[in-house]
């Protein structure tokens, strides 16, 4: 069977006027997962995103991440899209005073 991922979006200061947003998927099985950023619903090009490898997390499941750098103040235009074992979901960037957003998918 499949185990759906826990998806967590975080933000961190990158440089003046920019922030790095990171979308992490964890505790999923099997290992094939789509994780990518969108701006205004349009997929970002590969060359503007950085991906972590899909790695075992020690519990028989996997974890990975994707990150991109965006302009501060434009967070609401960006979403992380996840697709795994026939299920999909989108995840917004948390506002500046809330650093974590996570959800487990069934």
């Amino acid at each position: 069977g499949s185990v759906p991922p826990m998806v967590n979006v975080t933000r961190s200061e990158a440089s003046e006027g920019n922030i790095t947003v990171t979308c992490r998927a964890s505790s999923f099985y099997p290992r094939n997962i789509t994780l990518t950023w969108r701006q205004d619903g349009v997929s970002l090009s590969h060359d503007t995103q950085q991906w972590g490898d899909v790695l075992p997390d020690g519990n028989g499941t996997y974890q990975t991440w994707v990150a991109t750098r965006i302009c501060q103040g434009e967070e609401q235009r960006f979403t992380c899209y996840m697709e795994h074992s026939g299920n999909h979901s989108t995840h917004p960037v948390p506002s500046g005073n809330s650093h974590h957003h996570h959800h487990h998918h069934h």
Epitope: R38, S43, H46, W51, V54, V66, Y81, S85
Partner: antibody, heavy 120, light 107 residues
């Protein structure tokens, strides 16, 4: 076994619209993206656009104003509609499943294609 | 858009030969490159993805390499079923773009 099969009108008059259906089997459209690619006679391949598992679409900006991609998950069908056809839209039109895993994005299974001729 | 150039439109080789097909991008594409095979009947098949990874079922005589803007596909031991056109495709930037193709024929 993953399969995709295109069906189209064959002949379209100039300025008219084109509708092609891609019927898939062996996988669910809710969990995979489907791409459209075309190939004019004697030329290379051109990516037109794609529809993701959640129904979101990405288009080739050069054709975006004339293109629409949609789907019916329950019928396992993806639809390509292109408006205002001209003779240089004559091509073989393919649908292909997209696999998008981190740094890897590729079209792993293709349909046989359907030939569309734009002529009066 | 990123332009993909395959300078050799067609090449003739003998069965058993080692064949190399080149592809260059108009800018660096960070190994975001795939290769496809199109048979004479129009059937298209994924041959190599992410520069050098072979999908299951693709014979090991096919290999890919490259970096930056320059990439290549090598067939180490040409067989009759390899007679086809070969296309490179980048996905570093949207839209994904293909090279013009290289047709491999038997000498």
């Amino acid at each position: 076994q993953v399969q995709l099969k295109e069906s189209g009108p064959g002949l379209v008059a100039p300025s008219q619209s084109l509708s092609i259906t891609c019927t898939v089997s062996g996988f669910s459209l809710t969990g995979s993206g489907v791409n459209w690619v075309r190939q004019p006679p004697g030329q290379g391949l051109e990516w037109l656009g794609m529809i993701w598992g959640d129904g979101n679409t990405d288009y080739n900006s050069a054709l975006k104003s004339r293109l629409s991609i949609s789907k019916d998950n329950s019928k396992s069908q993806v639809f390509l509609k292109m408006n205002s056809l001209q003779t240089d839209d004559t091509a073989r039109y393919y649908c292909a499943r997209g696999a998008h895993y981190g740094k890897r994005w590729y079209f792993d299974v293709w349909g046989a294609g359907t030939t569309v001729t734009v002529s009066s | 858009d990123i332009q993909m150039t395959q300078t050799t439109f067609s090449l003739s080789a003998s069965l058993g030969d080692r064949v190399t097909i080149s592809c260059s991008a108009s800018q660096g594409i960070n190994n975001y490159l795939n290769w496809y095979q199109q048979r004479p009947d129009g059937t298209v098949k994924l041959l190599i993805y992410y520069t050098s990874t072979l999908p299951s079922g693709v014979p090991s005589r096919f290999s890919g390499s490259g970096s930056g803007t320059d990439y290549s596909l090598t067939i180490s031991n040409l067989e009759p079923e390899d007679i086809a056109s070969y296309y490179c495709q980048q996905y570093s930037k949207l839209p994904p773009t293909f090279g013009g193709g290289t047709k491999v024929e038997i000498k």
